[in-house]
């Protein structure tokens, strides 16, 4: 675009240099050239000469009119055709942008990943705005009335050190750009209710050589939370439908879960946990693939025992994946993609 251009005249835009996409736009060019009475004034958009909807208003000024301008960005410049000059003479240039006012941020969620030292808040930004849009996260203590504000572009990480005066907060997000401002709904947050246990990991699996082979899946977490409720989902790699088994877990030792599965099949396992009785789940763990052993000739396989799960007091349900390419539906953004909240001396500029 045109950032610094020495103008020999002026260029201005109505309704303004940033306007709502789809609006009718008039761009004016006024020359102030010495020793030139221009025969013609020309407009260029992104370097290409425009031919239509140009009006010469008077000797020094011309206007180009766009019906329903819908390009997010364009750079405009205008030139003069001066008698006796072989080349056109530059008059002025302007960057113009079109976009939308922001939608109200929706689905605001705040969680604390155990051991992270941060409260991470995410939200849906709505439809693209095409122009620079900022998000201000407001965090107001319900106990002290103190309000903190954080700048963000798509999510925010707030150090729990700055949330020590209180346990209960009101959180909301304000979306702002040149065309408008919208607020999300307010979210009531109790810091004790939004902790997500440290990641659960499936470490290994083995299939025993018994008459009826059983597969034991070993899984663990470094969580310090005592009461944890977990789900393990599993399916053959060729299947669309997940079976889900539920557990009350105590991670003071490695968890072992038993399954009676199809022989000679490749299975995918994933686990996720939450603090018992709370709302927020971990994302599903990385897929763990295990091949069950081949059936020996002696064994009579009983297909009617499908879904081949050792029936204990735990619940088993079936869930169909939307797509075989998407076995891992994230409940929220994975922590690994977040940028770190700027430490002192490490400033993040979203300007």
């Amino acid at each position: 675009g045109i950032t610094s251009i020495n103008c020999s005249g002026d260029m201005w835009v109505e309704p303004g240099e940033i306007f709502q996409m789809g609006m009718n736009v008039s761009i004016y060019c006024q020359e102030a050239l010495k020793h030139c009475r221009p025969r013609n004034l020309y407009f260029y958009k992104n370097g290409f000469k425009e031919e239509f909807d140009i009006t010469r208003i008077n000797r020094t000024t011309a206007r180009i009119w766009y019906k329903g301008f819908s390009e997010p960005h364009a750079y405009m410049h205008c030139t003069a055709e001066c008698p006796g000059h072989f080349q056109e003479t530059l008059i002025c240039g302007k960057d113009i942008s079109s976009g939308h006012p922001p939608d109200a941020p929706s689905n605001l969620t705040c969680v604390i990943y155990e051991y992270s030292g941060n409260m991470t808040c995410t939200w849906n930004t709505g439809k693209p705005t095409y122009i620079d849009t900022k998000y201000i996260v407001h965090v107001k203590s319900l106990e002290t009335e103190e309000e903190q504000q954080y700048l963000a572009s798509s999510y925010v990480k707030i150090s729990t050190d700055s949330l020590q005066g209180s346990r209960k907060y009101l959180v909301w997000v304000q979306a702002v750009n040149s065309l408008g401002m919208e607020n999300s709904q307010q979210l009531h947050v109790h810091l004790d209710d939004i902790v997500i246990p440290s990641a659960s990991i499936i470490s290994r699996a083995e299939t025993t050589n018994d008459t009826v082979p059983k597969t034991i899946v070993y899984w663990k977490s470094k969580t310090m939370i005592e009461k944890v409720f977990c789900e393990m989902r599993y399916k053959t790699t060729t299947n669309q439908t997940w079976s889900v088994k539920e557990f009350d877990a105590n991670f003071t030792y490695v968890q072992q879960s038993e399954f009676y599965l199809e022989p000679d099949s490749k299975y995918v396992f994933q686990v996720r946990c939450q603090e018992t009785g709370k709302r927020n789940w971990q994302p599903w763990s990385s897929p763990f693939v295990h091949q069950t052993s081949q059936e020996t000739g002696k064994r009579n396989w009983q297909p009617w025992s499908s879904p081949f799960v050792h029936q204990t007091s735990q619940t088993v349900s079936q869930v169909t994946a939307k797509s075989s390419h998407e076995p891992q539906k994230m409940e929220m953004l994975s922590a690994t993609i977040f940028r770190g909240h700027p430490a002192s001396g490490n400033h993040q500029d979203i300007g």
């Epitope: 201000i136 103190e146 504000q149 700048l151 150090s159 700055s162 909240h341 993040q348």
Partner: nanobody
């Protein structure tokens, strides 16, 4: 009692530099977002730059690339480094609590005059 005291203004030629400071007291500066605003002669208040407690910054288009906002929470001080000053930067500069948008900037200091003139 919340107090904000700006300093560092003065007369400077176009293209010159100034560094404004804002000494804060009476509130938890380290947990507060802060903004620089300015008022040109005969005009309303305009925001210039903002910074949150984590150091994330934002700038008005008119000063982007020329001005830099920073903070020192140990000294309870907000700064604005102004380079490549233009005549249109002439204004009274105030520091204020909060971020630029949706604010009336009621909680602000007395201001420091910046005059850019040849």
């Amino acid at each position: 009692q919340v107090q904000l005291q700006e300093s560092g203004g003065g007369l400077v030629q176009p293209g010159g530099s100034l560094r404004l400071s804002c000494a804060a007291s009476g509130f938890t500066f380290s947990r507060s977002a802060m903004t620089w605003v300015r008022q040109a002669p005969g005009k309303g208040l305009d925001w210039v730059s903002g910074i949150d407690s984590g150091g994330t910054t934002v700038y008005a288009d008119s000063v982007k690339g020329r001005f830099t906002i920073s903070r020192d929470s140990a000294k309870n001080t907000l700064y604005l480094q102004m380079n490549s000053l233009k005549t249109e930067d002439t204004a009274v500069y105030y520091c204020a609590i909060g971020l630029p948008w949706g604010n009336t900037w009621r909680t602000r200091g007395q201001g420091t005059q910046v005059t850019v003139s040849s």
